[in-house]
């Protein structure tokens, strides 16, 4: 009795859904009473399916309402674990153990990343030095480095601060600032680079606005 996996590594985005599956041999009709399916992650029990019933009492609380065994897939010889709203804590090595006449188990790794997609930006002017301060802030995982460039393909020196945005989500809060003497309409780019997944790089475009001129009759002295 041997079980197989089509993938032993799943890489998914934070907040998305994932279905990991282990395949086992089924000849014609599936005998549910003879089937045992366990899904575990490290020391956490996720699924305990015995004699056609799922025992939710043993399920670790972190998977409550989020993890389920897709019962209809069992008849196709697939023990499919679906996890919804994936968190960073869900990353790790999963083990599917199946008993059906014989017994076998396989390991599957789940990696979770959170792209720095939503970049907040701000442009301000230092009234003393007339320097512009450009700021880009975003949340993601794992940590990202931020590079600043201009439209002439030059890399500029910004200052980046990384903190944990929320102890619950474990996402990183990355804030980068660039102080520069510049003029209206110049374009700058802040790019959040994730070495682990280059396709997850995100960029914001910052255009220096025209200076805000206060009409002479509205100026305060």
């Amino acid at each position: 009795f041997t079980i197989t996996v089509s993938k032993d590594l799943y890489v998914v985005e934070y907040g998305s859904n994932v279905t990991m599956e282990c395949r086992f041999p089924v000849e014609e009709q599936l005998d549910l009473v003879s089937l045992i399916v366990y899904w575990e992650m490290e020391d956490k029990k996720i699924i305990q399916f015995v004699q056609g019933k799922e025992d939710l009492k043993v399920q670790h609380r972190s998977y409550s309402q989020r993890a389920q065994l897709l019962k209809d897939q069992l008849f196709l010889g697939k023990a499919a674990l679906q996890i919804t709203n994936v968190t960073l804590e869900d990353a790790g090595v999963y083990c599917c153990l199946i008993g059906y006449g014989g017994a076998d188990y396989k390991r599957i790794t789940l990696k979770v990343h959170a792209p720095y997609r939503k970049i907040n930006q701000r442009i301000s002017v230092d009234p003393v030095t007339s320097e512009h301060e450009l700021m880009c802030q975003a949340e993601g995982y794992p940590t990202a480095e931020v590079i600043w460039t201009n439209s002439a393909h030059q890399v500029l020196n910004g200052k980046t601060i990384i903190s944990v945005s929320n102890m619950e989500t474990k996402l990183f809060n990355v804030t980068s600032t660039l102080r520069i003497n510049t003029t209206a309409n110049e374009i700058f780019y802040c790019t959040f680079l994730q070495r682990s997944s280059p396709e997850g790089n995100s960029t914001a475009e910052l255009v220096i606005p025209e200076p805000f001129l206060v009409p002479a009759n509205e100026r305060t002295h």
Epitope: S151, E186, I187, T203, E205
Partner: antibody, heavy 121, light 111 residues
């Protein structure tokens, strides 16, 4: 149609000056960094100068620094290269080239047909 | 300055066959998770035309017969299959650091 048309080339004596122009059309000129690239008679390509979209930042290789000045007029959609203290090794076909738009798109994606500069006594 | 050495200086390939052009950089052109190597095609009497950027990305409108590969210091432009219209000189160019430099070119001819 995206188009770059260079003009202003010609024959000039060593030590002389010349100003090249490049007329851009078919794209939002003021959003792009621009460059000049030259091709020597031996067909070697050399980057000459770059300028940011707003004209604030300019960059040059050491071979032309202090002698060449790149500038632009976004209202007229024109790019310029002022060349002075010209040397025989500046003889080349000068191309106006658009820089790739966005972060990390570091390439020349549109080229003009070029204008020839000959430095000879 | 980063020196780019292209090889061969010229090559003749039969129609329908594969052409491989190499470009070696005197130092790495990799940074920020990218390889900043570009490839251009120049036909006689015409300006250079961008084919491949960041080592392996095909420029819009360029046929899939053209492909690029490599990282750090060693890069390759492959044309497969070669067509009559591909007769040109091909240049590699690094944009990882100033001054931006070009290779000496490889002239492709049909056998």
């Amino acid at each position: 149609e995206v188009k770059l048309v260079e003009s202003g080339g010609g024959l000039v004596k060593p030590g002389g000056s010349l100003k090249l122009s490049c007329a851009a059309s078919g794209f939002t000129f003021s959003s792009y960094g621009m460059s000049w690239v030259r091709q020597t008679p031996e067909k070697r390509l050399e980057w000459v100068a770059s300028i940011s979209n707003g004209g604030t930042y300019t960059y040059y290789p050491d071979s032309v620094k202090g002698r060449f000045t790149i500038s632009r007029d976004n209202a007229k959609n024109n790019l310029y290269l002022q060349m002075s203290s010209l040397r025989s090794e500046d003889t080349a076909l000068y191309y106006c080239a658009r820089l790739g738009y966005g972060s990390l798109n570091w390439y020349f994606d549109v080229w003009g047909a070029g204008t020839t500069v000959t430095v000879s006594s | 300055d980063i020196v780019l050495t292209q090889s061969p200086a010229s090559l003749a390939v039969s129609l329908g066959q594969r052409a491989t052009i190499s470009c070696r950089a005197s130092e790495s052109v990799d940074s920020y998770g990218n390889s900043f190597m570009n490839w251009y095609q120049q036909k006689p009497g015409q300006p250079p035309k961008l084919l491949i950027y960041r080592a392996s990305n095909l420029e819009s409108g360029i046929p899939a017969r053209f492909s690029g590969s490599g990282s750090r210091t060693d890069f390759t432009l492959t044309i497969n299959p070669v067509e009559a219209d591909d007769v040109a000189t091909y240049y590699c160019q690094q944009s990882n650091e100033d001054p931006r430099t070009f290779g000496g070119g490889t002239k492709l001819e049909i056998k």
